[in-house]
């Protein structure tokens, strides 16, 4: 799913207030709901009819530093016999997410939001049929 | 997938530098990769063997204000005949994502990161069999 554009109005002060100096704003330390938990079913990436693998990307100047990307293992889906069926398609499910980018020059540290496209997993779909012409 | 805890070290200045005053830091306005595009297949939520619906939640003090949550339509998966097969399971694929929470008192505006658990879609899995003892 797509994150709408900011239009940057979200980060502006009300019109009646003095503008933010230097094009930056105050970000409080600490994260709300930091102990939130993902309750995904065990090993769904292997048990799915559209199985996937995970690749981890690491960047120490990004929060979170670790971003996990899924890759569908097959073009088709796995049928009840455990065989690949290419009349169906394994397709990636993508999500736009925000990360925080850290920029520093000596003791001057600033942060900026960054959009990252994450493939979260795969699902099995009936393909769009473009019948033989 | 789970976002690891910050440990808040990410947002701290190097040890040799003076600490951040008032427990806040500088967040630059603007978003890197704002024009990133999601290239998800058309109508996958309806064409999937584990179809889902979307619900939109809206909060003007959150960025993005709109967060879309998926809900699996069925317990089972849709078979080749278009019927639900409860020998398989539709399960949610979840992703932890960051949003920005806006807090204001008069002209004083600050922001804080918040973790949100998003169900991005559903996938069809072979259920875990718990044999009768």
């Amino acid at each position: 799913r797509k994150i709408p554009k900011v239009g940057h109005t979200f980060f502006q002060k009300p019109e009646s207030c003095p503008p933010v100096p230097g094009g930056s704003m105050k970000l409080d330390i600490g994260i709300i709901n930091e102990n939130q938990r993902v309750s995904m079913s065990r090993n769904i990436e292997s048990r799915s009819t559209s199985p996937w693998n995970y690749t981890v990307t690491w960047d120490p100047n990004r929060y979170p530093s670790e971003v996990v990307q899924a890759q569908c293992r097959n073009l088709g889906c796995i049928n009840a016999q455990g065989k690949e069926d290419i009349s169906m398609n394994s397709v990636p499910i993508q999500q736009e997410t925000l990360v925080v980018r850290r920029k520093h020059q000596g003791c001057s540290v600033s942060f900026q939001l960054e959009k990252v496209l994450v493939t979260v997993g795969c699902t099995c779909v009936t393909p769009v049929i473009h019948h033989v012409q | 997938r789970k976002i690891p805890k910050v440990g808040h070290t990410f947002f701290q200045k190097p040890e040799s530098c003076p600490p951040v005053p008032g427990g806040s830091m500088k967040l630059d306005i603007g978003i890197i990769n704002e024009n990133q595009r999601v290239s998800m297949s058309r109508n996958i939520e309806s064409r999937s063997t584990s179809p889902w619906n979307y619900t939109v939640t809206w909060d003007p003090n959150r960025y993005p204000s709109e967060v879309v949550q998926a809900q699996c339509r069925n317990l089972g998966c849709i078979n080749a005949q278009g019927k639900e097969d409860i020998s398989m399971n539709s399960v949610p694929i979840q992703q932890e994502t960051l949003v920005v929470r806006r807090k204001h008192q008069g002209c004083s505006v600050s922001f804080q990161l918040e973790k949100v658990l998003v169900t991005v879609g559903c996938t069809c899995v072979t259920p875990v069999i718990h044999h009768v003892q």
């Epitope: 569908c72 073009l75 065989k83 069926d85 009349s87 394994s90 769009v128 019948h131 | -």
Partner: antibody
């Protein structure tokens, strides 16, 4: 008009790799899978695998699984088939073929002759 | 892998006469979705194969109506009602119900 234009003939030594390209035009590239089928001189047709141009997902014939790699470049509407550890029995014409789900392989490239000889 | 067996492997036909090619698969080609993914191709000398019939009995665009396909399960037939000189070449049956996709060994049609 639909067209699949393949790269030219190649001569390779045993143990080498070959990469054949196939450029599609005349239709929406990401709407159709592309297969690779080969035909040894005077012999029948053998399916090697298929790639989904939109996602880059693949399905390979197990016979070639460890030696074949299919890739896609959507910016140029081109798919590639790389075959490694070539042996003399890989001498064949390699065809790139458009495939519509459950219908059939409806349009074929002109073929690329790969000769493996020491 | 599904084995596709064609017969005869060659046939010589007088122009205007009918011809028939049989194709048998080692397993049923009926998919769980009800479709049967059995197709016929013709490879003319010095050319890539071309699609004639898809899903047992559907003629591809531009294919003359003298070509017809029939069959079900594991037994399939391609018929040419009146053979013409341009029909020479090798005919292949192929299945795409199961991975890997497989082809018959080919039937060579010649004109007497």
């Amino acid at each position: 008009q639909f067209q699949l234009v393949q790269s030219g003939a190649e001569v390779k030594k045993p143990g080498a790799s070959v990469k054949v390209s196939c450029k599609a035009s005349g239709y929406t590239f990401t709407d159709y899978n592309l297969n690779w089928v080969r035909q040894a001189p005077g012999k029948g047709l053998e399916w090697m695998g298929v790639i989904h141009p939109d996602y880059g997902t693949t399905s390979y014939n197990q016979k070639f699984k460890d030696r074949v790699t299919m890739t896609v470049d959507t910016s140029t509407s081109t798919v590639y088939m790389e075959l490694s550890s070539l042996r003399s029995e890989d001498t064949a014409v390699y065809y790139c073929v458009r495939y519509d789900y459950g219908d059939a392989m409806d349009y074929w490239g002109q073929g690329t002759l790969v000769t493996v000889s020491s | 892998d599904i084995v596709m067996t064609q017969s005869p492997l060659s046939l010589s036909v007088t122009p205007g006469q009918p011809a028939s090619i049989s194709c048998r698969s080692s397993q049923s080609l009926v998919h769980s979705n009800g479709n049967t993914y059995l197709h016929w191709y013709l490879q003319k000398p010095g050319q890539p194969p071309q699609l004639l019939i898809y899903k047992v009995s559907n003629r591809f665009s531009g294919v003359p109506d003298r070509f017809s396909g029939s069959g079900s399960g594991t037994d399939f037939t391609l018929k040419i009602s009146r053979v013409e000189a341009e029909d020479v070449g090798v005919y292949y049956c192929s299945q795409s119900t199961h991975v890997p996709l497989t082809f018959g060994q080919g039937t060579k049609l010649e004109i007497k």
